[in-house]
Amino acid sequence: DSEEDEEHTIITDTELPPLKLMHSFCAFKADDGPCKAIMKRFFFNIFTRQCEEFIYGGCEGNQNRFESLEECKKMCTRDNANRIIKTTLQQEKPDFCFLEEDPGICRGYITRYFYNNQTKQCERFKYGGCLGNMNNFETLEECKNICEDGPNGFQVDNYGTQLNAVNNSLTPQSTKVPSLFEFHGPSWCLTPADRGLCRANENRFYYNSVIGKCRPFKYSGCGGNENNFTSKQECLRACKKGFIQRISKGGLIKTKRKRKKQRVKIAYEEIFVKNM
């Protein structure tokens, strides 16, 4: 009956720029590749936080490579999202801080943070992994920096640069390199099959997390849990994700299950990821 109460209370999106969370490849070093061509390209420099020119050899390299300055800016800077370094003490919050949290339509189960305009605080919510809106942050700190008021009524920017309230100077903090791989299985994929309490005998599928496969079971027609799919395909789509790579728009990319270690070269460090 709570569904009936909610029926006409629909959370509506507002006129905002599209969701533009930082792409992790924007942190990669410029990579000219092994070939010998001389091609003018652009990359995002995490030290200067700007898009800059470099010479690309014409093959291989990485995703931090763009044909135009505009494309680089669009993919790697936060200007479009009003997430720019604050230069005044009293800065308006970006519009998206006032949006309701939006889990999106996908079926992941990812912890994210949003600014709750009622409580004036950043709070946790579960994000499905695609779409949603811009009031969606990977860390509590990022959410606070962008949407909450600081202790002296000022805000800090999301790159970790804080406005010094004494002399208006910018104090750079350490730059955080985004992690590239995470595992986020929807929690219901880990629950056992639950027939429910009714008397029907419907053919359904559930994800067996022990063997890592979707298996048939008989559903009673009511009750049960969310580990319950009408087709094997739907079950696999929702649950058999293995390692998933965080790349863009707060979204997810499924990666192939390889047994070898995968080596990811990124600015400052090399991250080794062992796939399951």
Epitope: E3, E6, E7, T9, I10, I11, T12, D13, P18, L19, H23, E71, K74, M75, D102, P103, I105, C106, R107, G128, G129, C130, L131, E226, T230, E234, R237, A238, I247, S248, K249, G251, L252, I253, K254
Partner: antibody
């Protein structure tokens, strides 16, 4: 097996409201893993997504900017259906209208389509 | 909006041919891409979701690949029932958008 059955008038006068309904069988409009969309198709525009609703402990919607000021998509949990209302229609809104289910941005089940002609 | 551009807009091929259709997004959509097939007078039918996953019941001669901005639908050996219009669709951002379609005709 999930099925979507569309209903509504095929002829609407300019400036009036286009109203279509999509009845769902084999799934629930308030399923926490589904999203329900309206899409239209016309020779000039191709396939155009108009908007969607979905339930995740409360109802959410998203609309295409091109129709945002004129569109409403509503769920009807008692009848297990959802509806499209498009106000102030013009001949440009003449198209085949489809409802669709999307689990993860993937529109895997579609209604049969309704040709709506806007003409006086 | 994210624009999806398909090429070619139409092609003629014979039964048994290998057919490739490309779809380019105006910005990176990572793997948020689906392919649909539509026959005259019918609703579109989901073929491939998330770039390369075959929808249940779709023949294995259909395959998809790509990432970022460039994607491909391949029909390894064209069958008589494959003559139709094919659409790509992104769900990386609102509004969800489709390509303009590629019509596969009999040569």
């Amino acid at each position: 097996q999930v099925q979507l059955q569309q209903s509504g008038p095929g002829l609407v006068k300019p400036s009036q409201t286009l109203s279509l309904t999509c009845a769902i069988s084999g799934d629930s409009v308030s399923s926490s893993s589904a999203a329900w969309s309206w899409i239209r198709q016309s020779p000039g525009r191709g396939l155009e997504w108009l908007g969607m609703i979905y339930y995740r402990s409360k109802w959410y919607n998203h609309y295409a900017v091109s129709v945002k000021s004129r569109i409403t998509i509503n769920p009807d949990t008692s009848k297990n259906q959802f509806s499209l209302q498009l106000n102030s229609v013009t001949p440009e809104d003449t198209a085949v209208y489809y409802c669709a289910r999307g689990g993860s941005g993937v529109m895997d089940v579609w209604g049969q389509g309704t040709l709506v002609t806007v003409s006086s | 909006d994210i624009q999806m551009t398909q090429s070619p807009s139409s092609l003629s091929a014979s039964v048994g041919d290998r057919v490739t259709i490309t779809c380019r997004a105006s910005q990176s959509i990572t793997n948020y891409l689906n392919w649909y097939q539509q026959k005259p007078g019918k609703a579109p039918k989901l073929l491939i979701y998330d770039v390369s996953n075959l929808q249940s019941g779709v023949p294995s001669r259909f395959s998809g690949s790509g990432s970022g901005t460039d994607f491909t639908l391949t029909i390894s050996s064209l069958q008589p029932e494959d003559f139709a219009v094919y659409y790509c669709q992104q769900y990386s951002g609102y509004p969800l958008t489709f390509g303009q379609g590629t019509k596969v005709e009999i040569k």
